[in-house]
């Protein structure tokens, strides 16, 4: 469970791909599309709102008790807007929500270098977010070694 | 209730070698970042190892890069600092500490009780 | 690498004083910043986290701000279990400690 209903800080940040491919967000349609792109020298990359949670790891699974926290994001490009795990369709979807946000748009976040994250669907353990032909896609994780797998790897900047 | 306990502190002649351990207990030691990070007499905190939770990447400051190795078992929930080619100036307590959060690198959030290693002919 | 530099490095306080401790970080670490307590003898203990979150079980009294490379820790009430050294510490980019802040008995 979320431990607190506003998150603990926010973060607006670019994010790109470990390969620093840019993640862009194009109103299409009035739905939004998710792509992952080269972006041209000078040209603005998309910021992203990042907010963090405190969530309970369920102590029967971790033996932590109290003391199995992990950090929960939620990824919004625009306002209103956050990042969504299909899992029906392993892919990942920008979708208009209001508050309290369903599990869908929480994300476990993960760093398994120091400079950078991957971001685990909650409603899916062992699912993450990750780059599948120019776009995102949900991806099964099937051991920690292959948390380090590059196209689950995203780096965060402020730039 | 989350325990680390070091061992391995001691004297040891410079240029020479001495490997510290951590016992962690009450916690899911693989899901976590682990630490070392060492204080010299009277002076101040110095973050000098840390190891990601499946032991994929290990890091360093310049100041023992290359003369320290964090690593860390697993299955006997056990972190380690080989400490090689030892100067004076690693005389320090060598606490052992673990992330705040399951899977992710930021804070400190439970700290052992430290070793003392001092290094002198 | 990231410097992280604490002022002042020691100072002198009475029972029920406000107290206010500051560390610049030599680049932006967002709110990438904690703040420890450490009494004699003892290791260090989590205070505050990601800037402004107080760790289970710290008093109230304790506080932190900032954002970016400006950070401050308040204790607004010193009492006599307050005396100790306060580091800050950054984890937005490696890991990196200030240099402390010994709060004395005036």
């Known amino acids: 469970s979320i431990t607190g209903i506003s998150p603990i800080t926010e973060y607006l940040a670019s994010l790109s791909t470990y390969n620093d491919q840019s993640i862009t967000f194009a109103l299409e349609d009035e739905s939004y599309e998710i792509y992952v792109e080269d972006l041209k020298k000078d040209e603005k990359k998309d910021k992203v709102l990042l907010s963090y949670y405190e969530s309970q790891h369920p102590s029967n699974e971790s033996g932590d008790g109290v003391d199995g926290k992990m950090l929960m994001v939620t990824l919004s490009p625009t306002k209103d807007f956050w990042l969504h795990a299909n899992n029906k369709e392993h892919s990942v979807e920008l979708h208009k929500s209001e508050k309290p946000l369903p599990d869908q748009a929480f994300f476990v976040l993960h760093n398994m270098h120091s400079n950078s994250v991957s971001f685990e669907s909650k409603t899916d353990p062992g699912v993450f977010i990750g780059v599948k032909d120019n776009h995102l896609a949900l991806i099964k994780v099937d051991s920690s070694e292959n948390l380090s797998t590059e196209n689950i790897l995203f780096k965060l900047s402020e730039t | 209730e989350v325990q680390l306990v070091e061992s391995g502190g001691g004297l040891v002649q410079p240029g020479g070698s001495l490997r510290l351990s951590c016992a962690a207990s009450?916690?899911?030691?693989?899901?976590?970042?682990m630490y070392w990070v060492r204080q010299a007499p009277g002076k101040g905190l110095e973050w000098v190892a840390a190891?990601?939770?499946?032991?994929?990447?290990?890091y360093y400051p310049e100041s023992v890069k290359g003369r320290f190795t964090i690593s860390r078992d697993n299955a006997k929930n056990s972190l380690y600092l080989q400490m090689n080619s030892l100067r004076a100036e690693d005389t320090a307590v060598y606490y052992c500490?673990?992330?705040?959060?399951?899977?992710?690198?930021?804070?400190?959030?439970?700290w052992g009780q430290g070793t003392l290693v001092t290094v002198s002919s | 690498d990231i410097q992280m530099t604490q002022s002042p490095s020691s100072l002198s306080a009475s029972v029920g004083d406000r107290v206010t401790i500051t560390c610049k970080a030599s680049?932006?670490?967002?709110?990438?910043l904690d703040w420890y307590q450490q009494k004699p003898g003892k290791a260090p203990k989590l205070l505050i986290y990601?800037?402004?979150n107080l760790q289970t079980g710290v008093p109230s009294r304790f506080s932190g701000s900032g954002s970016g490379t400006d950070f401050t820790l308040t204790i607004s009430s010193l009492q006599p279990e307050d005396f100790a050294t306060y580091y800050c510490?950054?984890?937005?980019?490696?890991?990196?400690f200030g240099g402390g802040t010994k709060v004395e008995i005036k």
């Open positions: 680049q932006n670490i967002n709110k990438h």
């Open positions: 009450g916690f899911t030691f693989s899901s976590y970042w």
């Open positions: 990601f800037t402004n």
């Open positions: 190891i990601t939770p499946n032991a994929g990447e290990d």
């Open positions: 510490f950054q984890y937005n980019q490696g890991w990196t």
């Open positions: 500490a673990r992330g705040h959060y399951y899977y992710t690198s930021y804070s400190l959030g439970y």
